[in-house]
Amino acid sequence: HLYPGEVCPGMDIRNNLTRLHELENCSVIEGHLQILLMFKTRPEDFRDLSFPKLIMITDYLLLFRVYGLESLKDLFPNLTVIRGSRLFFNYALVIFEMVHLKELGLYNLMNITRGSVRIEKNNELCYLATIDWSRILDSVEDNYIVLNKDDNEECGDICPGTAKGKTNCPATVINGQFVERCWTHSHCQKVCPTICKSHGCTAEGLCCHSECLGNCSQPDDPTKCVACRNFYLDGRCVETCPPPYYHFQDWRCVNFSFCQDLHHKCKNSRRQGCHQYVIHNNKCIPECPSGYTMNSSNLLCTPCLGPCPKVCHLLEGEKTIDSVTSAQELRGCTVINGSLIINIRGGNNLAAELEANLGLIEEISGYLKIRRSYALVSLSFFRKLRLIRGETLEIGNYSFYALDNQNLRQLWDWSKHNLTITQGKLFFHYNPKLCLSEIHKMEEVSGTKGRQERNDIALKTNGDQASCENELLKFSYIRTSFDKILLRWEPYWPPDFRDLLGFMLFYKEAPYQNVTEFDGQDACGSNSWTVVDIDPPLRSNDPKSQNHPGWLMRGLKPWTQYAIFVKTLVTFSDERRTYGAKSDIIYVQTDATNPSVPLDPISVSNSSSQIILKWKPPSDPNGNITHYLVFWERQAEDSELFELDYCLKGLKLPSRTWSPPFESEDSQKHNQSEYEDSAGECCSCPKTDSQILKELEESSFRKTFEDYLHNVVFVPRKTSSGTGAEDPRPS
């Protein structure tokens, strides 16, 4: 009885109804169900379509632009549970731009376990105000139900019996309104006694077993549930899967051979995107969690000692990284079996992208070659590279080779980075911004000092266009306020003072004191530092009155730590010898200041002598908030309140329904229809700033959702004929 049909994979049914028949024997959809983009379908096409076996969807249900579909009551009459294990943009049920849908009609839907509901832009859709979503899901306040016919108060929603003057359906209170609850004119919403929680109840109102979810055919029997609250095993609902079973997809128990079959099917299929399932914490899951690696003999995830190794074998023994895309193919690799050639001419946000994809590499068995990578400023994106073995060498016996990198200024921050090169030599030619001191430092750190021959490191073509700072600038004065930092540093003059063009002050927010100069920089304009150009001070012949150059940094955030450094800007001297100076990176925190106002104050009186006041912290604390000040003042009573005859006829209903204390505004906004007196004399008040801001935020949120929806559902047609569903990357 429990899940009588098959377990089907997630489905994406689009363009026409042909594939809808694949749902015929499905009791459970393990994944999501998307039905969308059917522009030629008509109401009659759906008349005889019904899938009564479908009880549960484990991820989400999405309906988008399916023409002709007027109700879901016949299509999914027994859909009871949507688990929301994976959501579509935080939603488990999305009904969007369904132009002909008149009612939802999911009259057996009893539980949305995780996520909320988004029902938007369905201009024929009624029977929304008659649904009490709080009986189906917990996070009602996150529901987004707007721009439906229901909004315009044009719906004449009539629950069963109402036409005959009877009330057949249960009524519940939302926002102070006592309303009958139904899905259609012929289907009430089933409301179980509160003590049944989400387990469901029989038609007589007897609670289902605590392991049931949503409904059952007999009370208090875990084999008579319609769906399971926790896990399903051999016809009964169980709290947890007993040995030798494993939890699978958060809803059922499977044995080892089931998990093993999945693992081998994927391993043997070579199909991209499939998962080689493994076992961890009594679960059969797609892959080991971070920090674990699979033991191939028993599929168990075992903790890694240190970071988990992932050995990547390179075809033909080497790989050229010439774009972010090619770098992505090595994402997660910790050991490269082969050699890497980096040849990056351009790209967006390169430093961050390269670090995300190559930042875990610890070891390269062959050589590393950096060639004509005009976009690179630093190699610090190889954040974890510790060993180049040099088992295969570039022609000339080189294990590290850097040629013609026009903007390369730093190899690594050698104060924080260790690199060993087991065998092979270094080669550096035509790296005009790379100071020789950087190269010599690499020789020392990597253990290659003494291996190089005379022409391996070119003295004339490395660092010949760089300001190879050989002096340390010190900050002589640092003064902070809440939004400014005033800095001065010691004067610096090169041998020919005319060579000093000025100073460059670099700064950025730095919550942690772990910043390096080349973090986030590439030669294509990406730079996480804000840079200020500062003219040199007037030069005085009297050394006593030499001004310390400085800068007042303005417009900073209060109570925020900034990383700051300064360097000289000097011209290139004729002798190809460039002087310069640079400070260490210092960290300076701006002062605290007054916080912004506390947000969303709500007051409710819970007795004749008490007022409860709640609020949220300010959006800009601007320091450590230690306490709040609450001011109150007794106000004179409004005499009108005493003079009004409350028995007078014609008193209007309040224009706003009472809301329980501390219910979020959203839940009111999306779950109540407000009475508005449009016939009155009054004109509407102008919108307050906060209302305008809220509307802007809402419209921005709406756009974000629509962008997400379009990005996910519109996929290019597959050129090959295949029936596999698209994988739209649900969140």
Epitope: K474, F475, S476, Y477, I478, R479, T480, S481, K484, L486, R488, E490, S545, N547, H548, L552, I586, Y587, Q589, D591
Partner: antibody, heavy 113, light 107 residues
Framework: EVQLVESGGGLVQPGGSLRLSCAAS????????IHWVRQAPGKGLEWVGW????????KYNEKFKGRFTFSLDTSKSTAYLQMNSLRAEDTAVYYC??????WGQGTLVTVSS | DIQLTQSPSSLSASVGDRVTITCRAS??????LYWYQQKPGKAPKVLIY???SLDSGVPSRFSGSGSGTDFTLTISSLQPEDFATYYC?????????FGQGTKVEIK
């Protein structure tokens, strides 16, 4: 040559007020902080606070907030320290300094009845 | 507030002696420390800024070192004009604070 000259010190009764002046010359007055520091007889140095002539922003040592106020007359390149509700323990030599590098000669304030 | 503790509070030395004065901060101040010399009836005079940089016109017998919380002022060969009181000052965070001073006297 940079010079800072304080004036306005003298004898004042407890509870009284006094305004000290710091006249600056020899540099661009608006670009550098003016700090005030005091030194009680035979004691160490104590920082009072700063004022930035570029925009008039100030910061005070919490100990002096409320009683001491900084102000400026940029046309005269002069900074002022207004001291109210003076106490005997405010007796000290008061210095103004251009960002710690140049100090005035100091002016003595004696609070006594 | 950051406390600066100087030691010793006074010392007697002869001309030509090497003199070391230490200044300990109650928390990390990086390298944001000045050393001043003050003679009776005079304003303080900067000797060293940023822990170790000699201000212009200051004789090279004065040197500073340290970082974090422990700092040192060294006079390599004491001269008659060096007998004075020496103060350290931190400018790492507000309020800026001085050490209590070290008086160097003639033995």
């Amino acid at each position: 040559e940079v010079q800072l000259v304080e004036s306005g010190g003298g004898l004042v009764q407890p509870g009284g007020s006094l305004r000290l002046s710091c006249a600056a010359s020899g540099y661009d007055f608006t670009n550098y902080d003016i700090h005030w520091v005091r030194q009680a007889p035979g004691k160490g140095l104590e920082w009072v606070g700063w004022i930035y002539p570029g925009d008039g922003s100030t910061k005070y040592n919490e100990k002096f907030k409320g009683r001491f106020t900084f102000s400026l007359d940029t046309s005269k390149s002069t900074a002022y320290l207004q001291m109210n509700s003076l106490r005997a323990e405010d007796t000290a030599v008061y210095y103004c300094a251009k960002e710690w590098a140049y100090w005035g000669q100091g002016t003595l304030v004696t609070v006594s009845s | 507030d950051i406390q600066l503790t100087q030691s010793p509070s006074s010392l007697s030395a002869s001309v030509g002696d090497r003199v070391t004065i230490t200044c300990r901060a109650s928390q990390d101040i990086g390298g944001n420390l000045y050393w001043y010399q003050q003679k009776p009836g005079k304003a303080p005079k900067v000797l060293i800024y940023a822990t170790s940089s000699l201000d212009s016109g200051v004789p090279s017998r004065f040197s500073g070192s340290g970082s974090g919380t422990d700092f040192t002022l060294t006079i390599s060969s004491l001269q008659p004009e060096d007998f004075a009181t020496y103060y350290c000052l931190q400018y790492s965070s507000s309020p800026w604070t001085f050490g209590q001073g070290t008086k160097v006297e003639i033995k």
